[in-house]
């Protein structure tokens, strides 16, 4: 059933991983770096999909993820045979207001305690991740091991 209450604006939040690295926009790419003075981490814009009835149940809350104030949204697309994470110029509210879920831009948001994971709706089993080494771009991975971090701390801003 469609959510009856229509939302006018996305929520805002900040994200860091378990190694206290934050997301920073560099040359139209999101990278995870240790927090430092005079650094400007991105503020995340997120909003739930209105059409949960057409998506798989029990995988998490389907959400659109964007960069607040920048008209950029995270999306998943195949490059060759490999699902990749990309930033696309798209208004998050345009995605929210569509009569269908836009799967390429949707992520199942799951929370366990303070940890959040973001699984691609378009490519189930693939999660937003950062390399454990840091200073690297955000990627999609299906390997939930030590090489990549898929757990993030999401703090909502009011």
């Amino acid at each position: 059933m469609e959510k009856a209450l229509k939302i006018d604006t996305p929520q805002q939040g900040s994200i860091q991983d378990i190694n206290h690295r934050v997301w920073v926009l560099q040359d139209q790419t999101l990278i995870a770096v240790p927090r430092k003075d005079r650094m400007s981490p991105v503020t995340i814009a997120l909003i739930s999909c209105r059409h949960v009835e057409t998506l798989e149940k029990d995988r998490g809350n389907p959400i659109y993820l964007g960069l607040n104030g920048l008209n950029l949204c995270l999306m998943c697309a195949k490059v060759g045979d490999q699902p990749t994470l990309q930033l696309k110029e798209k208004d998050i509210m345009d995605l929210y207001n569509q009569p269908e879920p836009v799967k390429s831009f949707l992520f199942y948001h799951s929370q366990s305690g303070r940890n959040s994971t973001f699984e691609s709706v378009a490519f189930p089993g693939w999660f937003i991740a950062v390399s454990s080494e840091g200073g690297c771009p955000l990627i999609l991975t299906q390997e939930l091991g030590k090489a990549n971090t898929t757990d993030f701390g999401l703090t909502m801003l009011f």
Partner: antibody, heavy 123, light 111 residues
Framework: ELQLQESGPGLVKPSETLSLTCTVS??????????WGWIRQPPGKGLEWIGS???????YYLPSLKSRVTISVDTSKNQFSLKLSSVTAADTAVYYC???????????????WGQGTLVTVSS | QSVLTQPPSVSGAPGQRVTISCTGS?????????VHWYQQLPGTAPKLLIY???NRPSGVPDRFSGSKSGTSASLAITGLQAEDEADYYC???????????FGGGTKLTVL
């Protein structure tokens, strides 16, 4: 068996407002899973989705028609309606109403359809 | 110009197999949106023939089948019969247009 029936004038003058109503029988318009939609087909041409409505009143419109279209629902009469303003000859078409169904993982589809009503825009 | 591209016409003799293609793009069929097919007999309203790429509603003969690959889909009709002569339309969703889209239609002639 669910049935839909369009009704309204078959002739509308240019610049006026086209008004059609779809009456649903054999089922409730207030079902939580379905939308209700309008599709049109100009003579000898293909199909074009106009817009859809949920029983709560949530609407979605084809962006290119959005400024001229209003779809409304009357759950007490089991009806939904289409208004298209400032019509021109290009709006001459057979107008169909339909239930807009969903399946998990697939975009919504139209089933069943009303028989359609031809609306001619002419002075 | 329709967003989904279909051949204007196809033909076949009774008993033969014909296919109708439906080509889209990365913002519709290629964006994880399935394809539905409708049959429109002369002078009547369209009727759902295939939904979700390859599912037949009850009452649709198994001579009709659908498939999807990449940014394209196709409808196959085997054992062609005279009553199959109709227009066939594919339908999907396009997120860049924020709307449901149809192919231009294919007229099937049974020779």
């Amino acid at each position: 068996e669910l049935q839909l029936q369009e009704s309204g004038p078959g002739l509308v003058k240019p610049s006026e407002t086209l008004s059609l109503t779809c009456t649903v029988s054999g089922g409730s318009i207030s079902t939580s899973s379905d939308y209700w939609g309008w599709i049109r087909q100009p003579p000898g041409k293909g199909l074009e989705w106009i817009g859809s409505i949920y029983y709560t009143g949530n609407t979605y419109y084809l962006p290119s028609l959005k400024s001229r279209v209003t779809i409304s629902v009357d759950t007490s009469k089991n009806q939904f309606s289409l208004k298209l303003s400032s019509v021109t000859a290009a709006d001459t078409a057979v107008y169909y109403c339909s239930r807009v169904r969903y399946g998990v993982g697939v975009p919504r589809y139209f089933d069943p359809w009303g028989q359609g009503t031809l609306v001619t825009v002419s002075s | 110009q329709s967003v989904l591209t279909q051949p204007p016409s196809v033909s076949g003799a009774p008993g033969q197999r014909v296919t109708i293609s439906c080509t889209g793009s990365s913002s519709n069929i290629g964006a994880h949106y399935d394809v539905h097919w409708y049959q429109q007999l002369p002078g009547t309203a369209p009727k759902l023939l295939i939904y979700g790429n390859d599912n037949r509603p009850s009452g649709v003969p198994d001579r009709f089948s659908g498939s999807k690959s990449g940014t394209s889909a196709s409808l196959a009709i085997t054992g062609l019969q005279a009553e199959d002569e109709a227009d066939y339309y594919c339908q999907s969703y396009d997120y860049s247009l924020s709307g449901y889209v149809f192919g231009g239609g294919t007229k099937l002639t049974v020779l």
